[in-house]
């Protein structure tokens, strides 16, 4: 996160860290807890690393440096990448992770509400992006979970800023015209959440941007409301019945 500040314990209890253990262990992506056994993240996090066994999912944590070999983590039972996601394109950047064992909810580890299907009418004015990603383009992973308040940008405006890309209705953009605040490398898959009527909802999944926090280059997020049918289908068909935080 560029231009952000430290988060507090329990402030974003749905935020998880997706880490890979090969020879060393490192944080690669963020994710959002959406049910006892489900995490929503970005499909591109798994490019080149589709093997379930190498992943460790840490929930209920604030500081990555607190993680030791004894820190509990979740393992992956199943990775469900959107069927239309292609490595050669930037569309449908969404994936579900089914955890091997369900998580208990606590003050520091609980799910985020999902939006209603095709939610286009709600005007979100209080939106935040969180993650342990770089604090500048050529930076490094941060220890303490960062947060930043960023306004949503219309898709029309976003398309003007990204003429070489197709900004679809299944994407949502956020950023300041002058730049300075944005998600960055390592924040991928994490949440863009907005507070509406006193409740936090998962509006976007951190997907991509041209650099980080550049002027007139907003961050681009996968629009969760556009994938509600897919999320419900996959979580229900896998579970028999959904163990989801009900859509708002």
């Amino acid at each position: 996160i560029v231009g952000g500040t430290n988060s507090s314990w329990g402030e974003w209890p749905w935020q998880v860290s997706l880490q890979v253990k090969l020879t060393a262990q490192r944080h690669l992506c963020g994710g959002s807890l959406i049910g006892h056994q489900w995490v929503l993240t970005a499909a591109h996090c798994f490019d080149g690393l589709p093997l379930q066994d190498v992943w460790r999912i840490y929930s209920g944590i604030l500081n990555l440096s607190d993680i030791t070999k004894d820190t509990p983590f979740s393992q992956i039972k199943e990775i469900i990448i959107h069927q239309n996601y292609k490595v050669s394109e930037g569309n449908h950047d969404i994936a579900l992770i089914k955890l091997q064992a369900p998580l208990n909810y606590t003050e520091f580890q609980k799910p985020i509400c999902l939006p209603s299907k095709g939610d286009t009418s709600t005007i979100y004015t209080n939106c935040w992006v969180t993650g342990w990603g770089f604090s500048k383009e050529k930076g490094e992973i941060q220890n303490i979970l960062q947060k930043v308040n960023i306004p949503l940008v219309t898709n029309e405006e976003c398309q003007k800023r990204y003429q070489d890309y197709k900004i679809t209705q299944r994407m949502v953009c956020a950023g300041y015209k002058e730049g300075g605040k944005d998600a960055c490398k390592g924040d991928s898959g994490g949440p863009l959440v907005c507070k509406h009527n006193g409740m936090w909802r998962l509006v976007g999944i951190t997907s991509w941007g041209e650099g980080c926090a550049r002027r007139e280059q907003p961050g681009v997020y996968t629009k969760v409301a556009e994938y509600m049918d897919w999320i419900l289908e996959k979580t229900q068909s896998s579970d028999g019945k959904a163990q989801m935080q009900s859509p708002a």
Epitope: A42, H44, D47, K86, V87, S88, E89, G90, N91, D93, G133, Q163, D164, Y165, K166, A183, C184, K185, G186, D187, S188, T206, S207, W208, G209, E210, G211, C212
Partner: antibody, heavy 125, light 108 residues
């Protein structure tokens, strides 16, 4: 199967014009940025131009700026290169290529993942 | 413009040997925008490596790419007969997009 097929090459006199076409199949053409690359006989590869998925944004190499025009017809899945005021140094095999633009570590990637077989343009009197 | 300088110009090696090809850029290039292509005589170029280190679909694991910033390397761990040809690095970080002049890998 993803395929690109160029046509329209041939022999043309200096100062003349030629229009190259590139027919795309096997993928959603309107989702992809497309590019032209050329290769003079016995030489290396030279990027010529690219066009955005909608066709609204184009960029050219200095060597062809003002003389060449890239365009596309998404309804026909076809890419074009209109070449005017041709010079001897434009003699080359012209390739069209699809520009893949995935995502890695929250940044876009960019690379030419599919190439046509090429069409030879010879500029000579 | 970003200049791409490949070395050596020609590499003469026997099958089974290791080939190391270098590509230097005149300015910082985001790794996501650095690719390597192989071209054999009379054929169109073929994508080998994208994002500086990711192998394209169908490319054998004897091909690997590394590097960051201004120094990039393509390595062929054990040369096979079909690997002989010319290799190009290319950047699309900034326009104009540019290619290196190529490294020719020939049979010793």
């Amino acid at each position: 199967e993803v395929q690109l097929l160029e046509s329209g090459g041939g022999l043309v006199q200096p100062g003349g014009s030629l229009r190259l076409s590139c027919a795309a199949s096997g993928f959603t053409f309107s989702h992809y940025l497309m590019t032209w690359v050329r290769q003079a006989p016995g030489k290396g590869l030279e990027w010529v131009s690219y066009i955005s998925p909608s066709g609204g944004h184009t960029i050219y190499a200095d060597s062809v700026k003002g003389r060449f025009t890239i365009s596309r017809d998404n309804s026909k899945n076809t890419l074009y290169l209109q070449m005017n005021s041709l010079r001897a140094e434009d003699t080359a095999v012209y390739y069209c290529a699809r520009v893949a633009r995935g995502i890695a570590a929250r940044s876009r990637t960019s690379y030419f993942d599919t190439w046509g077989q090429g069409t030879l343009v010879t500029v000579s009197s | 413009d970003i200049q791409m300088t490949q070395s050596p110009g020609t590499l003469s090696l026997s099958p089974g040997e290791r080939a190391t090809l270098s590509c230097r850029t005149s300015q910082f290039v985001n790794s996501n925008y650095l690719a390597w292509y192989q071209q054999t005589p009379g054929q169109a170029p073929r994508l080998l490596i994208y994002g500086a280190s990711s192998r394209a679909t169908g490319i054998p694991d004897r091909f690997s790419g590394t590097g960051y910033g201004t120094d990039f390397t393509l390595t062929i761990s054990r040369l096979e007969p079909e690997d002989y040809g010319t290799y190009y690095c290319q950047q699309s970080s900034r326009t104009p997009w540019t290619f290196g002049q190529g490294t020719r890998v020939e049979i010793k």
